[in-house]
C-alpha cells in the first residue's frame, strides 16, 4: 500500500494511527470515528488537553494510546463517551496528575502512565491503591513522583474521602409534616456535594439549601410513601467519593387486607399489612384467638426494600373441615388498628350427620379480661378428638 500522507492513517479494519510530528492539537473530527476500536497517537507535542468533546463519537473505542506527546491535562469526564475503553496508555507525556474520576466507570485492564512527571499528593491515592492491589498493570511500571520518589512510598494517612454525617429528626414524623435533614461534610479538599433523591418521586416536596460543608434538605408535606426510601448525601474530594443514605420514618396507622385462600404446597390465606411502625398481628378463627402451631402459622414473604407493606400467608398444613370458618387478621400500631375477615372452606364436613363437631385443639375464646394481649388457655375447655378409619 502507498504511504499515507495524512496526519492520521487507517490501521487494520478499525484502527487509526496518528504519528506525523506535531500534526494534531486536538482529537476533533477524526476520520471514521464512530467505528474506531483502536486509536494510536504519538509525537503530538501540541496535543496538551484531553477533554469530553475530544472523544465524543468514539463509542466503540477499546484501546487508546497517546504517547510521547504533550498531554498535560486529562479532564475528569474525558472518557464519558468511551465506556468500552479497556486499554489506556498515556506514557511519556507531561501529566502531573490524573483524577480518580477519569477512570471511574471504565473497566480498564491496562493503564500505562510511566514516563510522566507525576506529582504525588492525595489526588493520586487511587493510583497508589491500584499499585497496591495489582490493578491495570500499574505495579510493573514502578511509578515515580517527580522530585519525590516512588508512588508506593507516598504517605496516605491523611488521604481519606470526605466524612459525612446526616442528621435526621429524632421526633416522630407524621403524614403532612415538614422534615429538615442536614448533611455535615468534613474532610480535606472538598470539591462537590449534593443530595440524591431519585427514590422520592411524589413522597414529598423537596427544597435544597446551603452548600459545603453543611447541606440542608427540606422535605415538605411528607406522605407515607416516604418510608423506606433512601435519601442520600454525597460528597467528593480529590481522593474519591463518599455517600451516606438515611430513611425518614413517617408514622401512619395500621391497615390490613385479606385475600381468598389458595391451595399451594400448603393452603395459604394471603394477606397484606401496612403501617409505620410495623403493626403487631393477631389471627382470630370464628371470633376466637388462633394460637399458631407447626400446622397453622404465619409466614412472611421477603419484604421489598423500599416499601413498608408486608405480604404473607397464614399457612395451613393439610387443613380439614374443622378448619373451615371465618378468619380475621387484626393489625395494630400506636397510630391505629385495622382488621379484615374472610371465609375459608378447605374441605366438606364428612360428618354432616353429627352437629357437634369437636372444637379444634389450637383455639380458645378471646378472654375479654386479659390485659396482656396473649391468648389465655382455659383448662376446663380441653377439646376431644375423633378419629375415623375410612374404607
Amino acid at each position: 500500500a502507498a504511504p499515507c500522507p495524512d496526519a492520521c492513517c487507517p490501521h487494520g479494519s478499525s484502527g487509526l494511527r496518528c504519528t506525523r510530528d506535531g500534526a494534531l492539537d486536538s482529537l476533533h473530527h477524526l476520520p471514521g470515528a464512530e467505528n474506531l476500536t483502536e486509536l494510536y497517537i504519538e509525537n503530538q507535542q501540541h496535543l496538551q488537553h484531553l477533554e469530553l468533546r475530544d472523544l465524543r463519537g468514539l463509542g466503540e473505542l477499546r484501546n487508546l494510546t497517546i504517547v510521547k506527546s504533550g498531554l498535560r491535562f486529562v479532564a475528569p469526564d474525558a472518557f464519558h463517551f468511551t465506556p468500552r475503553l479497556s486499554r489506556l496508555n498515556l506514557s511519556f507525556n507531561a501529566l502531573e496528575s490524573l483524577s480518580w474520576k477519569t477512570v471511574q466507570g471504565l473497566s480498564l485492564q491496562e493503564l500505562v502512565l510511566s514516563g510522566n512527571p507525576l506529582h504525588c499528593s492525595c489526588a493520586l491515592r487511587w493510583l497508589q491503591r491500584w499499585e497496591e492491589e495489582g490493578l491495570g498493570g500499574v505495579p510493573e511500571q514502578k511509578l515515580q513522583c517527580h522530585g519525590q520518589g516512588p508512588l508506593a512510598h507516598m504517605p496516605n494517612a491523611s488521604c481519606g474521602v470526605p466524612t459525612l454525617k446526616v442528621q435526621v429528626p429524632n421526633a416522630s414524623v407524621d403524614v403532612g409534616d415538614d422534615v429538615l435533614l442536614r448533611c455535615q461534610v468534613e474532610g480535606r479538599g472538598l470539591e462537590q456535594a449534593g443530595w440524591i433523591l431519585t427514590e422520592l418521586e411524589q413522597s414529598a416536596t423537596v427544597m435544597k439549601s446551603g452548600g459545603l460543608p453543611s447541606l440542608g434538605l427540606t422535605l415538605a408535606n411528607v406522605t407515607s410513601d416516604l418510608n423506606r426510601k433512601n435519601v442520600t448525601c454525597w460528597a467528593e474530594n480529590d481522593v474519591g467519593r463518599a455517600e451516606v443514605s438515611v430513611q425518614v420514618n413517617v408514622s401512619f396507622p395500621a391497615s390490613v387486607q385479606l385475600h381468598t385462600a389458595v391451595e399451594m404446597h400448603h393452603w395459604c390465606i394471603p394477606f397484606s399489612v401496612d403501617g409505620q411502625p410495623a403493626p403487631s398481628l393477631r389471627w382470630l378463627f370464628n371470633g376466637s384467638v388462633l394460637n399458631e402451631t407447626s400446622f397453622i402459622f404465619t409466614e412472611f414473604l421477603e419484604p421489598a426494600a423500599n416499601e413498608t407493606v408486608r405480604h404473607g400467608c397464614l399457612r395451613l398444613n393439610q387443613p380439614t373441615h374443622v378448619n373451615n370458618g371465618n378468619y380475621t387478621l387484626l393489625a395494630a400500631n400506636p397510630f391505629g388498628q385495622a382488621s379484615a375477615s374472610i371465609m375459608a372452606a378447605f374441605m366438606d364436613n364428612p360428618f354432616e350427620f353429627n352437629p357437634e363437631d369437636p372444637i379444634p385443639v389450637s383455639f380458645s375464646p378471646v378472654d375479654t379480661n386479659s390485659t396482656s394481649g396473649d391468648p389465655v388457655e382455659k383448662k376446663d375447655e380441653t377439646p376431644f378428638g375423633v378419629s375415623v378409619a375410612v374404607g
Epitope: 515515580q144 519525590q148 491523611s158 480535606r188
Partner: antibody, heavy 119, light 106 residues
C-alpha cells in the same frame, strides 16, 4: 552518615553565571531527588528546582526556567546548579537538599553557598 | 502556585511559654512540613507530613491541621528554640514556603 557538602562563596558581576556544587556522601546518590532552594538576605525560602541523579530528569520553578541548569556527575556523586544572567536580586544563600522518599521530606541540607551579585 | 501564609511573622516569648504558630494554605493541601532555621545555618526539618516529628526533634514540638489550616506548637519553649520557623507545602508544584515566624526572647 548522610552529608551534603557545598562549594564555597562566590562573588559575581551582573550578567555573569555561577555554578554551585553539592557533593553527596553516605547514601546511594542516584536513588534520591536532589533539590535546590535559595534564601535572599533577611527573606524566606524559595524553591528553584530538582534533579533525579539516576537519569538526569529535572523540574524547575517557572521563574527559573531558561536561567537555571541542573546537572549531575554520578562518578563523583555531585549535583550542580548553574544560574546565568545574574542580577542583583539573585544575591542569596543557595542550598541543596535531598528528598528522602522513605519518610517523604527534605531530610538533609547542605551548609549553603553564598552568591553575591554586585557590580 | 499555592501561597502559604504564616502568622505571626514574629513573636516574643519567655522560656517555658507555650507557643503556637499557624500556617494557612491558599487551597487545600495533602500534608505540611515545618522547618527550624537559626541565623547562618541551613533549615532543619522539624515535622513532616503534618504531625510526624523529624529525627532527634524533642517531643515538646507538635504539628496538627488539615485542609488549609495548620499549626506548630511548642509546649514549653526552651532557650535553644529561639529561631525562625517555616512551613512548606508540596501538594502541587512548585513546593512553596511560608514567609517565616521569628521567635525571639522576651
Amino acid at each position: 552518615q548522610v552529608q551534603l557538602v557545598q562549594s564555597g562563596a562566590e562573588v559575581k558581576k551582573p550578567g555573569a553565571s555561577v555554578k554551585v556544587s553539592c557533593k553527596a556522601s553516605g547514601y546511594t546518590f542516584t536513588t534520591y531527588w536532589m533539590h535546590w532552594v535559595r534564601q535572599a538576605p533577611g527573606q524566606g525560602l524559595e524553591w528553584i528546582g530538582t534533579i533525579y541523579p539516576g537519569n538526569s530528569d529535572t523540574s524547575l520553578a517557572q521563574k527559573f526556567q531558561g536561567r537555571v541548569t541542573l546537572t549531575r556527575d554520578t562518578s563523583t556523586s555531585t549535583a550542580y546548579m548553574e544560574l546565568s544572567s545574574l542580577r542583583s536580586e539573585d544575591t542569596a544563600v543557595y542550598y541543596c537538599t535531598r528528598f528522602y522518599f522513605e519518610d517523604w521530606y527534605f531530610d538533609v541540607w547542605g551548609q549553603g553557598t553564598t552568591v553575591t551579585v554586585s557590580s | 502556585d499555592i501561597q502559604m501564609t504564616q502568622s505571626p511573622s514574629s513573636l516574643s516569648a519567655s522560656v517555658g511559654d507555650r507557643v503556637t504558630i499557624t500556617c494557612r494554605a491558599s487551597s487545600s493541601i495533602s500534608w505540611l512540613y515545618w522547618f527550624q532555621q537559626k541565623p547562618g545555618k541551613a533549615p532543619k526539618p522539624l515535622i513532616y507530613y503534618t504531625s510526624t516529628l523529624g529525627s532527634g526533634v524533642p517531643s515538646r514540638f507538635s504539628g496538627s491541621g488539615s485542609g488549609t489550616d495548620y499549626t506548630l506548637t511548642i509546649s514549653s519553649l526552651q532557650p535553644e528554640d529561639f529561631a525562625t520557623y517555616y512551613c512548606q507545602q508540596w501538594h502541587s508544584y512548585p513546593p512553596t514556603f511560608g514567609g517565616g515566624t521569628k521567635v525571639e526572647i522576651k
